[in-house]
């Protein structure tokens, strides 16, 4: 912490301006009034403060607003946002998308994924739900940030907003997030025709159950391998060779080059070698011909 000293009269600060870059840390601490700083936050970003000086300014604001900054200050943080920790941000209440845009721009190119995730979370809480305007802002200013939200927060997305989500916005989503988003997407796109539906639902399929994947295999969709490999393991394992062949169409050929990766590897191990041979890929590791498959999990469930 910066030690407290008295401000020399000639150094007294009446407005936030360029002259402050010549102040030492202890002079900034002694001479800058926190309320003045908060009132003139919009000027701070135009002044080339050092990171050390920004630390002092942050300390000032922290003292003035121990319960968290008001949005009027947050909106104008500029590069001071780079000094914020997730713990700081958790105290904020943010409702304005202009504030979100401003801070997302500042964070670009910096390693701030935890801070950005917390900020987005605060915006969703502040606005009450993940509405279309918020989704549009995220996709425009922070591709992939949608996936930084918890499944709980994502559950507040109305199905009507799903159409605004682009495939690249879901690249970093995990299975638990796609589990939440998939049923909403299914609902949002339910009135579309077969091929159009598949193109739209494709990025969300990591959350699809086996029965939906089986249904897709009957529709000539030609699922690409990257999409297939993002399907839930539990959704892939029950599929037959014939179903996978129908599902992937021409892309089934790619199983050979991805046979060491899950879920392809796990699926191969559950198929009869005879059936795998029909794919014309030289895939090995299936259940040898003449072997009997016992599903012990069924017996355990009955006892």
């Amino acid at each position: 912490d910066v030690e407290r000293t008295t401000c020399p009269p000639e150094k007294e600060v009446h407005e936030i301006d360029e002259s402050l870059i010549f102040y030492k840390k202890r002079e900034l601490e002694a001479c800058v009034d926190a309320a003045l700083l908060a009132a003139q936050m919009d000027r701070v970003d135009a002044i080339p403060f050092t990171y050390e000086q920004l630390d002092v300014l942050k300390h000032k604001l922290d003292e003035l607003y121990p319960q968290g900054y008001p949005e009027s200050v947050i909106r104008h943080l500029g590069h001071l946002f780079l000094k914020m920790s997730p713990e700081d941000i958790r105290k904020w209440n943010v409702t304005s998308l202009e504030t979100l845009k401003a801070l997302l721009k500042v964070s670009k190119g910096h390693e701030m994924s935890a801070q950005v995730a917390t900020l987005i979370d605060r915006v969703v809480v502040g606005r009450g739900q993940l509405d279309k305007d918020t989704v549009d802002t995220l996709t425009a200013f922070c591709p992939g940030c949608l996936c930084s939200l918890s499944p709980e927060r994502l559950s507040s997305v109305p199905p009507s907003v799903i159409g605004a989500v682009r495939p690249q916005d879901l690249d970093t989503c995990g299975p638990r997030q796609l589990d939440v988003l998939y049923p909403k997407a299914r609902l949002a796109f339910q009135n579309m025709s077969g091929s159009e539906y598949f193109v739209k639902i494709r990025p969300f399929l990591g959350g699809a159950p086996t029965e939906d994947v089986k249904a897709l295999s009957q529709q000539n969709v030609s699922m690409d391998l990257a999409t297939f490999m993002k399907l839930r393991r539990e959704a892939v394992l029950p599929l037959t060779v014939a179903e996978v062949q129908k599902l992937l169409g021409p892309h089934v050929e790619g199983l050979k080059v991805e046979e060491q990766h899950s879920p392809v590897r796990d699926w191969i191990l559950k198929q009869r070698q005879d059936d795998l041979d029909t794919l014309g890929l030289g895939l090995q590791g299936g259940i040898p011909n003449g072997y009997l498959i016992l599903d012990l999990s069924v017996r355990e469930a009955l006892s």
Epitope: D171, A226, H251, E253, G254, V257, L279, G280, L281
Partner: antibody, heavy 117, light 113 residues
């Protein structure tokens, strides 16, 4: 050594059909898919489709869907590509290419098909 | 369809110098599970069939000289010939095998300056 030997050059009239063959040797024929790619004179490469030699299942580029048929004869390790309703813009060198997984690892020498009235 | 855009269209390089060819796809070619990029590079010498050089964006096909290297991920890829030899005069094509119809770039003609 993997070899793909294609049938000879053909001259066809507009509206006719052409059937190009590709005889494979030097590997287990049913373990690798075959693709067909064409190249118009002085132009780039265009993927036409692929076929599973084990089952005979074939898949086509939608651009050729109604006009192309790919077949296989396992007894002679040969794949065929037939293109119907030929027009002058189908004049091209047609290549068969054996898959290396997804990419095209081995190519035939090409078959020039000329469509002219 | 995925559109593949190659640049430049042609390239004249002195013997022993570096040649760089770029290829851009209209959507990602990265399989985020396996981290494989579904992109291949081919060389076609005058009057010959194409020949595979690189697959998975950066894996050199066996028998291909190590002066050929591929790099890039997602949508932006590069083929580099570190020291151009006379026998490298050819047209070079990138191809995506991420989603059918598999599409090729327009080709880049490499010549000796």
């Amino acid at each position: 050594e993997v070899q793909l030997v294609q049938s000879g050059a053909e001259v066809k009239k507009p509206g006719a059909s052409v059937k190009v063959s590709c005889k494979a040797s030097g590997y287990t024929f049913t373990n690798y898919w075959m693709h067909w790619v064409r190249q118009a004179p002085g132009q780039g490469l265009e993927w036409m489709g692929n076929i599973n030699p084990s089952s005979g299942d074939s898949y086509y580029n939608e651009r050729f869907m109604s006009r192309v048929t790919m077949t296989v004869d396992k007894s002679t390790s040969t794949v065929y590509m037939e293109l119907s309703s030929l027009r002058s813009e189908d004049t091209a060198v047609y290549y068969c290419a054996r898959s290396g997984g997804l990419w095209l690892a081995f190519w035939g020498q090409g078959t020039l098909v000329t469509v002219s009235s | 369809d995925i559109v593949m855009t190659q640049s430049p269209d042609s390239l004249a390089v002195s013997l022993g110098e570096r040649a760089t060819i770029n290829c851009k796809s209209s959507q990602t070619l990265l399989n985020s599970v396996s981290q494989n990029n579904y992109l291949a590079w081919y060389q076609q010498k005058p009057g010959q069939s194409p020949k595979l050089l690189i697959y998975f964006a950066s894996t050199r096909e066996s028998g291909v000289p190590d002066r050929f290297s591929g790099s890039g991920s997602g949508t932006d890829f590069t083929l580099t010939i570190s020291s151009l030899q006379a026998e490298d005069v050819a047209v070079y094509y990138c191809q995506q095998h991420y989603r059918t119809p598999y599409t090729f770039g327009g080709g880049t003609k490499v010549e000796i300056k």
